[in-house]
Interface confidence: medium
Amino acid sequence: ADPGQDRTDLLNVCMDAKHHKTKPGPEDKLHDQCSPWKKNACCTASTSQELHKDTSRLYNFNWDHCGKMEPACKRHFIQDTCLYECSPNLGPWIQQVNQSWRKERFLDVPLCKEDCQRWWEDCHTSHTCKSNWHRGWDWTSGVNKCPAGALCRTFESYFPTPAALCEGLWSHSYKVSNYSRGSGRCIQMWFDSAQGNPNEEVARFYAAAMHVNAGEMLHHHHHH
């Protein structure tokens, strides 16, 4: 299925999920790593505050499920969560899902290759017990714990390459782009908002490409 197939509005939109606002807008008090989205965000200040906490109430997800996650690693997971909760520029990759906790998800968001590489480099000595974090946890305590038989090993054991981490971690929410940061063709997890949000241009590019593809398909069906 093509990404974004379920929506006609691809630009400046919020996903229909657990904590997202219905429409993006300014949020002056976004916390710490989520602050780059202040001018236009799908997250509230309280969501941004909460997601910086270990085992936050947002999802009861414990980053430290195999001992303390290195701070250099954890910052990437916080940034990933900020992008997920706050970005209004992921419309081209929204897909409908039938899940109890959300109606939509992202699929194959083209993450800039350096952002993925750096995430992997900063995390490969931290520890985990699973290669897909959407599925298979023991939730009996209310917080994710390693399932029986899942051994705590270094990230590199479960995510041997940058692609295995970025693409496998959240069931293909991301794919690693061939493009580099600043190209206007890939989504940056990290950016300096003083220069504006570079992901706006990326969303415009892919939304336009999707409209062209959709038009070609309509044209093709009309004539055949």
């Epitope: 290669s131 599925r135 298979g136 038989g149 295995a164 693409e167 069931s171 293909h172 794919k175």
Partner: antibody, heavy 118, light 109 residues
Amino acid sequence: EVQLVQSGAEVKKPGASVKVSCKASGYTFTIYAMHWVRQAPGQRLEWMGWINAGNGNTKYSQKFQGRVTITRDTSASTAYMELSSLRSEDTAVYYCARDISYGSFDYWGQGTLVTVSS
Amino acid sequence: SSELTQDPAVSVALGQTVRITCQGDSLRSNYANWYQQKPGQAPVLVIYGQNNLPSGIPDRFSGSSSGNTASLTITGAQAADEADYYCDSRVSTGIHVVFGGGTKLTVLG
């Protein structure tokens, strides 16, 4: 456009070795793992092992441990699979496949037929 | 055990719906991927992760999973869907991959 192009068919004698190459293009070679999978005539797919194209780390199926060696040349964006001590049961089509996350093989080479015959 | 079990053969009438299953312990904590292979050709990924279609794969293909069983469903099977279908999964206990034995799908009519 992502492409994996493999070397041509080989005929080998029992006891010999074979080295198959897989040239990747259209993506950043070092960010993905490359796996090798084989298929004997009329048989199922059989996973052999993989290499982390970034740092060269390898993992092999127990069945092939000691007989298979997977290497890569990052400057040529090419992965190699060498199988030694060949026997007739090794007659198969050998595929390289790019891994997006542990067994999601989104691109495959065209396959290389290796025939082991005396 | 790290085995993945598939029915060797399944048939479906043209235009009808068919489900191909894959069973194994590794599927309790890992998603299956599904491949279509036609004679003399390399396999083609048709479903990956939870229920994701690679571009170019028709949306009559879908995937699902429950417990230790993953399923590939083809809704409105076409003659072009006649092929062998393989599941694979990462093995929970190590950094290895295992394939199912394959299912030969015949489209009747």
